[in-house]
């Protein structure tokens, strides 16, 4: 095996081109200079290297940049990104949104891998906060991204970024996360008129306090049952029967089907039977 470590005569790579796909693994290792590879990374994705050959290219870059790759290399990794470990990525300093997008594209169609999670973490920490463009990008690739963040991490989301959030982005958020996001959304949408405001704020209402729900009940919003069921129990309990009736509008009839589930169950138990009877739904307190 020893003689294989030297590059065969006439095989030394002068540039990164298609001829390299016919090199055996050991020839690629012996005949491609790491510095040449780094300067011509933009060509790598144009060449149908085998999945095996990608391992060799990564090894070369690792030797050249033991402290982590520069962004000029990272932005051209393409499918080589699939070969990176979270440990590799922790050494990177990624500042360009275009670089982030290019690497996320490679992982498209999959759940967030540990590699992607590490990449995003490095990027966001480098930026200092989750700005609107970043959030736009991340939620486009990973609708559940926002709900993967801790309440502490969410606290760094500026209210202006909330405009990028779509209802499906909040599907997997728990109450603690919505507690952080709701005040930001309220601030972001504060200048909108009643009906438009409700459309925007609806997905965030799982973090709304009682007083805000009381205020909404005065605005003929006709909240659907799915949204009502996601409200905080402690925020729903103080609402009167009249307020819930106004809040739900024509959807109030849906309470009967949900009478055994929280928060409806707990709310019913707090009401006077006379008041519940006014709804005509047969709810028993």
């Amino acid at each position: 095996e020893v003689e294989k470590t030297a590059c065969p005569s006439g095989k030394k790579a002068r540039e990164i081109d298609e001829s390299l796909i016919f090199y055996k693994k050991w020839e690629l290792e012996a005949c491609v200079d790491a510095a040449l590879l780094a300067t011509q990374m933009d060509r790598v994705n144009a060449i149908p290297f085998t999945y095996e050959q990608l391992d060799v290219l990564k090894h070369k870059l690792d030797e050249l940049y033991p402290q982590g790759y520069p962004e000029s290399v990272i932005q051209h990794l393409g499918y080589l990104f699939l070969k990176m470990s979270p440990e590799d990525i922790r050494k990177w300093n990624v500042t360009s949104l275009e670089t982030l997008k290019a690497l996320l594209e490679v992982n498209k169609g999959h759940e967030m891998s540990p590699q992607v999670a590490t990449l995003i973490d490095r990027f966001v920490k480098g930026r200092g906060q989750l700005d609107k463009d970043t959030l736009d990008t991340l939620t486009a690739f990973y609708p559940g991204y926002l709900c993967s963040l801790s309440p502490e991490e969410l606290s760094s989301v500026p209210p202006s970024s909330i405009w990028a959030v779509r209802p499906q982005d909040l599907d997997t958020c728990d109450p603690r996360q919505l507690d952080v996001l709701y005040p930001k959304a309220r601030l972001a949408f504060q200048n909108m008129n009643g009906s438009e405001y409700f459309v925007k704020i609806q997905s965030f209402l799982g973090g709304a306090p009682t007083e805000d729900l009381k205020a909404l009940s005065q605005q003929n919003v006709s909240m659907d049952l799915a949204t009502f069921m996601k409200l905080r129990t402690d925020a729903v309990l103080p609402l009167t029967v009249a307020e819930v009736q106004k809040l739900l509008g024509p959807h109030v009839e849906g309470l009967k089907a949900e009478e055994r589930h929280r928060p409806v169950r707990d709310w019913i138990l707090r009401q006077r039977q006379d008041d519940l009877d006014t709804l005509g739904l047969g709810l028993q307190g």
Epitope: E18, I21, I47, T50
Partner: antibody
């Protein structure tokens, strides 16, 4: 929505030629590797050829090398498979598929029958 | 070329069963393996790539595992819509090659 639609299949005599088309929508073929994969009646999958996006580089299975040519027209967002010197053993449903190493989207396939 | 040998070639199972399909590569292919599902008259659908990565929209009852030359596709609880033919594929080296398929039939 990503879609691949093959066309151009049919009955052809041994030694004859056919050109299959793969019209893509919902993505730009200039950014993706396109593969042709075939499946003989009642048999398994056999990879035929690929065209690499950025460079237009092509690779072929030994069984079709020198007879088949894969190409792409980015302005039409369409890939092609030119099949010459067809043999009975080339009879199969031909699928085009997208993806660099694995294939995440496939067309519905077009049947090529080589028979006298 | 790298050969991919699938076993069994067919199996009969009932709804709710745990099903395991194996694929053996003729040489080490690291994690360069994908799995597909194909129903009669339809194109294959990607289930798993990089040996273990579940593709978007694929139910979590499907999982992939393995190392080097031996790979497994597991369906933890077979559903009626899972009766189909399954193929493994290696993409470690060109040409990419497929296993001969495993047909999962209703018992």
């Amino acid at each position: 929505e990503v879609q691949l639609v093959e066309s151009g299949g049919g009955l052809v005599q041994p030694g004859g030629s056919l050109r299959l088309s793969c019209a893509a929508s919902g993505f730009t073929i200039g950014n993706w590797t396109i593969h042709w994969v075939r499946q003989a009646p009642g048999k398994g999958l056999e990879w035929v050829a690929l065209i690499w996006p950025e460079s237009g580089a092509t690779l072929y299975a030994d069984s079709v090398k020198g007879r088949f040519t894969i190409s792409a027209d980015t302005s039409k967002n369409t890939a092609y498979l030119q099949m010459n010197s067809l043999r009975a053993e080339d009879t199969a449903v031909y699928y085009c598929a997208r993806g660099r190493y694995w294939m995440d989207y496939w067309g519905q396939g077009t049947l090529v029958t080589v028979s006298s | 070329d790298i050969q991919m040998t699938q076993s069994p070639s067919s199996l009969s199972a009932s709804v709710g069963d745990r099903v395991t399909i194996t694929c053996r590569a003729s040489q080490d292919v690291r994690d360069g393996v994908a799995w597909y599902q194909q129903k009669p008259g339809k194109a294959p659908k990607l289930l798993i790539d990089q040996m273990v990565r579940l593709y978007s929209g694929v139910p979590s009852r499907f999982s992939g595992s393995g190392s080097g030359t031996d790979f497994t596709l597991t369906i933890s609880s077979l559903q009626p819509e899972d009766f189909a033919t399954y193929y493994c594929q290696q993409y470690f080296n060109w040409p990419v090659t497929f296993g001969q398929g495993t047909k999962v039939e209703i018992k």
